[in-house]
Interface confidence: medium
Amino acid sequence: APRGTQAEESPFVGNPGNITGARGLTGTLRCQLQVQGEPPEVHWLRDGQILELADSTQTQVPLGEDEQDDWIVVSQLRITSLQLSDTGQYQCLVFLGHQTFVSQPGYVGLEGLPYFLEEPEDRTVAANTPFNLSCQAQGPPEPVDLLWLQDAVPLATAPGHGPQRSLHVPGLNKTSSFSCEAHNAKGVTTSRTATITVLPQQPRNLHLVSRQPTELEVAWTPGLSGIYPLTHCTLQAVLSDDGMGIQAGEPDPPEEPLTSQASVPPHQLRLGSLHPHTPYHIRVACTSSQGPSSWTHWLPVETPEGVPLGPPENISATRNGSQAFVHWQEPRAPLQGTLLGYRLAYQGQDTPEVLMDIGLRQEVTLELQGDGSVSNLTVCVAAYTAAGDGPWSLPVPLEAWRPGQAQPVHQLVKEPSTPAFSWPW
C-alpha cells in the first residue's frame, strides 16, 4: 500500500515551529511532508480552523523520475507584521486518499512592549468644562499598567496607581498636552501626545436689548475663556423662512448669514440695515487667541414694524355744494409693516381739529351741515401700521367757505366693505 495511507504513518516530515515576538514582527511557519504519487494541496489551520486567505506558498520536489515516486512538499505560511489576532496554534492539513493527516502544532505568540489600542486624540474643549480622554494598551505580557501625563508631568506616583483607560479632566483654563505611558514586563511604550486646546465657553443668555424697525441691539453673557482674554465676538443673523425650519441645534445656517464682529467688552452689538417687520435668527460665538467658542443656538428674533416713512400721496380735497370729497393714494415711501389704515384730520380756522380713522379706504366724503360757519378748512392724512402713524401730509386746503355756511360734520357716503385683513395679535 502507498505510504501515507495508514493512519499511524504521518506523511509530515516537518511541522510548524513556534514564533514568539513583538508586534510588527515578520515570521514564517513551515510544514514538510513526503508522499508517494501526486502531491496533495496543503491547508493551514489556526486553532483548528482552515485559513481560507492564508499567505502561503507550496513547493513540490519530485524525488524520482517516475510520477509514482515520492514527492517532497513544502508549505510556507508567511506572517507579516505580527498582531494579536495572529496568535494561536498552527497546523498543516492534507487529504491523502480517504484519510486526513494533520501535522503537529506550532505556536505563534506575541510578547513585547505594550501596544496601544487607543491613544488620546487632539481635541478642543471649552474652558473649565469637564471632559474625558481615553487610552488603552495591551501585551502580552500582561498586565499592562497606564500612567497619564499632563504637560509631561505624571498624574500619579506610579504606573497603575492613577486612572487607567479613561482620564476624567474636570476642566482646563489653558491649552495643555496629554499622553499616556503603558508599562509591562518588557518595558514602556509612550502614546502620542494629544493637544487639548482651550476655547472660550459658548456665550450664554443671547437676548434682545432693543428693537427698531431696521436694527436690533443684542447682548449676551460671555463664557469663561481660561487664561486667554476674548479678542472679539462674532454675531450671525439670517433671514428666517418658515419653510427652512432652523432647528436649535442645526449646525449651519440655511443661507449666507449677515456676519458682524463685536469688540469686547461690552458684550453687545447693534445690528443695522435689517428689514422692518421681518423674522431673523441670530447666534453668537466668541473668540480668544486659541480659537472660537461654539455657536449659541439660533435665537429667533423679529424686527418690529415701523411707521410708514412717508405720507399718503396725491391728496385731493374738492368741494361740491354741501359735500367735501377727499381722496388719496398709498404712500410711495416704504410702509415698514402692514398698512392698517389711514387717519384723516381736518380743521377750520377757528374750530378744533377733528381726527377720523378711515381704515383701509382711500376716500371720505364730509357732509357739511349745521348752523355754524367755518373758513379755511384744511385736511391732513397719515397712513398707519401697528407701530403707529407715519408722517402727516401737508395740509390740503378746501376752497374758502362762504360766510353763513355750515359747520362741517362728516359722514361716508359710499357703502364700505368690511376690512379684508386681520391683526397680528
Epitope: 389704515g341 381726527l355 401697528a386 403707529g388 402713524d389 360734520v409 361716508l412
Partner: antibody, heavy 120, light 107 residues
Framework: EVNLVESGGGVVKPGASLKLSCEAS????????MSWVRQTSDKRLEWVAS????????YYLDNVKGRFIISRENAKNTLYLQMSSLKSEDTALFYC?????????????WGQGSSVTVSS | VIVMTQSHKFMSTSVGDRVSITCKAS??????VAWYQQKPGQSPKLLIY???TRHTGVPDRFTGSGSGTDYSLTISNVQTEDLAFYYC?????????FGAGTKLELK
C-alpha cells in the same frame, strides 16, 4: 401681561382740582395711544380724552375741553388726567384704557378705575 | 357728534341660545365699531373691533358684523358667564361715543 392701575381719585368740592394717574406695565407704553373713559352711576360710558403714543396729539370731549388736560410721561410709563373746575356732573368712575394697535380709538385693555366724586 | 343707539336696554336669553345685540350709528362709521363686555364690579373688556375682528382670547361664539350705520354682536351658544352689559362704540372719529349698553340676562 398688560396691566393698568389708576390712582388719584377722591371726593372733592365743585370747582376743585384733582390729578389722576395711570401706571402701565407689560407693554411698550410709548407705542400705544391711551384714553380716559368715565362711567357714570347710570352705567353709561363716556369718552373723556385721548393722547397719541408720543404725546403730541390730544383729543377731548367738548364739555371737558379747557378744564381737563391729558398728558403722559413715557419714561415713567404713566398717563395723567389733570382735572380742574370740577363739576358735579364729572362724578364718575374714571378708567384709563390702552388703544388697540389696529386703531387706538378702540380700547383693548382697561384699568380697574379710579372713583371721582364732586359734591358740595 | 355720532350717536350710537342700542335700542334694547335688556335682552333675555337662555343658556345655549343664540342672541344678537344691535347698535345703530347716526351716520356711516365705515365699520369702525367696537364691542365691549362688562360684568358687575369689573372694567369693560374688548370683544370686537373694526366691526368683525375678534380681540385676542375672545371665544369664537362672539361674532361681530355690520357696515354703514347698522351693527350687531351675536353670541351663539350663550353661556352663563356671558351674562353682562354689552356696549358698542364707534372708533371712527372724535369725539368717541358709546352706546348706552344692553344688559343680557336670563329669561
Amino acid at each position: 401681561e398688560v396691566n393698568l392701575v389708576e390712582s388719584g381719585g377722591g371726593v372733592v368740592k365743585p370747582g376743585a382740582s384733582l390729578k389722576l394717574s395711570c401706571e402701565a406695565s407689560g407693554f411698550t407704553f410709548s407705542n400705544y395711544g391711551m384714553s380716559w373713559v368715565r362711567q357714570t352711576s347710570d352705567k353709561r360710558l363716556e369718552w373723556v380724552a385721548s393722547i397719541s403714543g408720543g404725546g403730541g396729539r390730544t383729543y377731548y370731549l367738548d364739555n371737558v375741553k379747557g378744564r381737563f388736560i391729558i398728558s403722559r410721561e413715557n419714561a415713567k410709563n404713566t398717563l395723567y388726567l389733570q382735572m380742574s373746575s370740577l363739576k358735579s356732573e364729572d362724578t364718575a368712575l374714571f378708567y384709563c384704557a390702552r388703544g388697540a394697535r389696529a386703531s387706538y380709538f378702540a380700547m383693548d385693555y382697561w384699568g380697574q378705575g379710579s372713583s371721582v366724586t364732586v359734591s358740595s | 357728534v355720532i350717536v350710537m343707539t342700542q335700542s334694547h336696554k335688556f335682552m333675555s336669553t337662555s343658556v345655549g341660545d343664540r342672541v344678537s345685540i344691535t347698535c345703530k350709528a347716526s351716520q356711516d362709521v365705515t365699520t369702525a365699531v367696537a364691542w365691549y363686555q362688562q360684568k358687575p364690579g369689573q372694567s369693560p373688556k374688548l370683544l370686537i373691533y373694526w366691526a368683525s375682528t375678534r380681540h385676542t382670547g375672545v371665544p369664537d361664539r362672539f361674532t361681530g358684523s355690520g357696515s354703514g350705520t347698522d351693527y350687531s354682536l351675536t353670541i351663539s351658544n350663550v353661556q352663563t358667564e356671558d351674562l353682562a352689559f354689552y356696549y358698542c362704540q364707534q372708533h371712527f372719529t372724535t369725539p368717541l361715543t358709546f352706546g348706552a349698553g344692553t344688559k343680557l340676562e336670563l329669561k
